[in-house]
């Protein structure tokens, strides 16, 4: 079972120094600051799921050296920044979508000995990202999001 933590009850102030090992900002309708880093030097798990995020400002994640799990499920991401993707030890949780192609390519080219990358469909099934991209995001196909027509991995 994944570790979890409760979300802060107050409005998020990005100037705050967060000391916890787990931060839950899920479903808050947040917009991430473009030129400001999250101050959370101990954080292992950061949950940003369900925030309607399209972009991931690379500066926001710059100082999260201890980050191991980044939950971005249920965000309509348009792309994943190469600098974030190049963090080989970062476990990214995201919906299956062609926007993850850059993440897959950067990992493939920069990270050796990695476990297979996964993505999640709308019914919360895991898929092999490589297989998803191959089937759903081949040149000429319309942009896709997770649909459930692929092999399930448990």
């Amino acid at each position: 079972q994944e570790p979890s933590c409760t979300m802060p009850s107050t409005d998020v102030d990005w100037n705050t120094e967060f000391s916890a090992t787990c931060l839950n900002f899920s479903g808050r309708g947040l917009s991430l600051p473009l030129n400001q880093s999250l101050r959370a030097s101990n954080v292992l798990l950061l949950d940003l799921s369900g925030n309607g995020l399209r972009e991931l400002p690379v500066t926001f994640f710059a100082h999260l050296q201890k980050l191991e799990v980044l939950n971005l499920l249920h965000n309509p991401l348009s792309r994943v920044d190469g600098a974030l993707a190049a963090r080989c030890d970062l476990d990214l949780r995201a919906d299956c979508s062609c926007a993850l192609e850059s993440w897959h390519e950067v990992r493939r080219d920069n990270c050796s000995g990695q476990k297979p990358l996964l993505c999640w469909d709308t019914t919360s099934f895991q898929h092999n990202l490589s297989a998803f991209l191959e089937v759903s995001c081949a040149p000429g196909l319309a942009p896709a999001t997770g649909s459930g027509h692929h092999h399930h991995h448990h």
Partner: antibody, heavy 125, light 107 residues
Framework: QVTLKESGPGILQPSQTLSLTCSFS??????????VSWIRQPSGKGLEWLAH???????RYNPSLKSRLTLSKDTSSNQVFLKITSVDTADTATYYC?????????????????WGAGTTVTVSS | DIVMTQSPKSMSMSVGERVTLTCKAS??????VSWYQQKAEQSPKLLIY???NRYTGVPDRFTGSGSATDFTLTISNVQTEDLADYHC?????????FGSGTKLEIK
């Protein structure tokens, strides 16, 4: 097989500096996510976390002792060191080092999966 | 600092009985709680992490549950080899803290 072993002086006098060594095998402290903590236990009492050193040499200390603690590591020789200055009889305890692993599947957890057998330290005049 | 309060301080049980140990955190720690077993003259051994995940090789009679501030370690069919001190610890926020322990005695 992961093992950790603590060593120390056994007995020392008040106001002296306590130097502890944790020698480990079966893992590398250069692996992302890996870390080692020092935890102590006075006889018949509970556990007290003292300090943690990360793979990237970042350190965290218990604020109640921070001014007296110095943590370091030698990655190549698989050792972690803790110094405690100005010891007092209250520092009499068994000192343990313990590993915080990085989960290959599903990171984000924090726990100590392997502990050393401990080294007993007595502060007495 | 987050205070972890364990209860009871000690308990005496017969083989085969069900044991429930509790740990209460002074503030919300999510599921960042571990349970350790410490037998006499030995170092602690990990039983449960993430509040409910049984560590490799730990018998399935040990079960952890809870989240936020209230946590429980249950031993469903206590055995003589379970005679030990049991410690809960939180790793949600520095400084990490432990409870004072529960001593389990076997009748």
């Amino acid at each position: 097989q992961v093992t950790l072993k603590e060593s120390g002086p056994g007995i020392l006098q008040p106001s002296q500096t306590l130097s502890l060594t944790c020698s480990f095998s079966g893992f590398s402290l250069s692996t992302s996510g890996m870390g080692v903590s020092w935890i102590r236990q006075p006889s018949g009492k509970g556990l007290e976390w003292l300090a943690h050193i990360y793979w990237d040499d970042d350190k965290r200390y218990n604020p109640s002792l921070k001014s007296r603690l110095t943590l370091s590591k030698d990655t190549s020789s698989n050792q972690v060191f803790l110094k405690i200055t100005s010891v007092d009889t209250a520092d009499t305890a068994t000192y343990y080092c313990a590993r915080r692993p990085r989960d290959y599947y599903g990171g984000g957890h924090w726990y100590f999966d392997v502990w050393g057998a401990g080294t007993t330290v007595t502060v007495s005049s | 600092d987050i205070v972890m309060t364990q209860s009871p301080k000690s308990m005496s049980m017969s083989v085969g009985e069900r044991v429930t140990l509790t740990c209460k955190a002074s503030e919300n720690v999510g599921t960042y709680v571990s349970w350790y077993q410490q037998k006499a003259e030995q170092s602690p051994k990990l039983l449960i992490y993430g509040a409910s995940n049984r560590y490799t090789g730990v018998p399935d009679r040990f079960t952890g549950s809870g989240s936020a501030t209230d946590f429980t370690l249950t031993i469903s069919n206590v055995q003589t080899e379970d005679l030990a001190d049991y410690h809960c610890g939180q790793s949600y926020s520095y400084p990490f803290t432990f409870g004072s322990g529960t001593k389990l005695e076997i009748k």
